[in-house]
Interface confidence: medium
């Protein structure tokens, strides 16, 4: 999916109102330093692309993200926001339902909701001064 | 590793064209705005022009404006600048350069190539 | 257009600050970026949005910017940081990058 056409502006809200801060619920107990950054991203579609792959597409060690509260309202953001995303996403949304729920918290998975909150970061990020 | 590699670049008399290419690795080409900067023998830094990351904006210098056109394929991981009606005053080393684009193009330069160079004589 | 003015050499000796101006009108309000470049080298991005320092930037490299000024501070300066040093800008009146003359640091 192409993310060049999504509302920047909205999902940059819906991150600082609610997926923000269940992104840190999910990290609680984690220090902040204890994991590297080794994701990153170079402009907002980028960082949208990598979100989504970071947050939706299991990886080793962590298949268990898509389930989480912070992944339901991704979800649902980019599917608000980002025109003809949702219509992208069903295969895959019925791929999921098809994997077994499984409510682990590896550290992997803690590494890799680190990695997204630094991309999530990124996305957001704050324009110093206005130019 | 990420690497920026100029090549086009070498002797032609005034009036004439050249065009510089750029090739990108080990990195996302096409997420980054990418610029020509130009340094004259024992000048300063130049800006010479900008191409978003999807090649829907340009933006040149005063000096070339009219002369140099920037462009990219982000197929090919290539940036180019064809320069045309040139000027003894465009003798010089010409880098291309990678920025991140996040708020139009108010981004610091993270990444050079090692440049290539243009001498303009009759 | 926009201009900002560097002094075009700063001396300073082993071990101690040298401290690097950028001047430009209300430079304070854009972001400014610093790069080094030695001899025969490509520049090197050494600071950017005013203050923030790539990971391989040794910590002695700082910035501030504020007003009419901008400055790239290195503290315990050594002979390999020996080099032009140029600041540079976004000017959003003109679309344009803008950099300085750049400054020649000497360590003596």
């Known amino acids: 999916y192409d993310f060049t056409n999504c509302d920047f502006e909205k999902i940059k809200a819906a991150y600082l109102s609610t997926i923000s801060k269940d992104l840190i619920t999910y990290m609680s107990g984690t220090k902040s330093t204890e994991f590297n950054n080794t994701v990153s991203c170079s402009n907002r579609p980028h960082c949208l692309t990598e979100i989504q792959s970071l947050t939706f597409n299991p990886t080793a060690g962590c298949a268990s993200l898509a389930k989480e509260m912070f992944a339901m309202k991704t979800k649902a953001a980019l599917a608000i926001w980002c025109p003809g995303y949702s219509e992208t996403q069903i295969n895959a949304t019925q791929a999921m339902k098809k994997r077994r729920k499984r409510k682990v918290t590896t550290n992997k998975c803690l590494e890799q909701v680190s990695q997204l909150q630094g991309l999530w970061r990124r996305f957001n990020r704050p324009l110093l001064k206005q130019q | 590793q990420m690497q920026l590699v100029e090549s086009g670049g070498g002797v032609v008399q005034p009036g004439r064209s050249l065009r510089l290419s750029c090739a990108a690795s080990?990195?996302?080409?096409?997420?980054?705005?990418m610029h020509w900067v130009r340094q004259a023998p024992g000048k300063g830094l130049e800006w010479v022009a900008v191409?978003?990351?999807?090649?829907?904006?340009?933006h040149y210098a005063d000096s070339v404006k009219g002369r140099f056109t920037i462009t990219r394929d982000n197929s090919k991981n290539t940036l180019n600048l064809q320069m045309n009606s040139l000027r003894a005053e465009d003798t010089a080393v010409y880098y291309c350069?990678?920025?991140?684009?996040?708020?139009?193009?108010?981004?610091?330069?993270?990444?050079w190539g090692q440049g290539t160079m243009v001498t303009v004589s009759s | 257009s926009y201009v900002l003015t560097q002094p075009p050499s700063v001396s300073v000796a082993p071990g101690q600050t040298a401290r690097i101006t950028c001047g430009g009108n209300l430079i304070g309000a854009k972001l400014v970026h610093w790069y080094q470049q030695k001899p025969g080298q490509a520049p090197v991005l050494v600071v950017y949005?005013?203050?923030d320092r790539p990971s391989r930037i040794p910590e002695r490299f700082s910035g501030s910017n504020s007003g009419n000024t901008a400055t790239l501070t290195i503290s315990r300066v050594e002979a390999g940081d020996e080099a032009d040093y140029y600041c540079q800008v976004w000017d959003h009146s003109s679309d344009h990058v803008v950099f300085g003359g750049g400054t020649k640091l000497t360590v003596l």
């Open positions: 350069v990678r920025a991140p684009q996040w708020y139009l193009s108010a981004e610091a330069f993270d990444l």
């Open positions: 949005d005013d203050s």
């Open positions: 080990g990195f996302a080409f096409r997420t980054y705005g």
């Open positions: 191409i978003w990351y999807d090649g829907s904006n340009t």
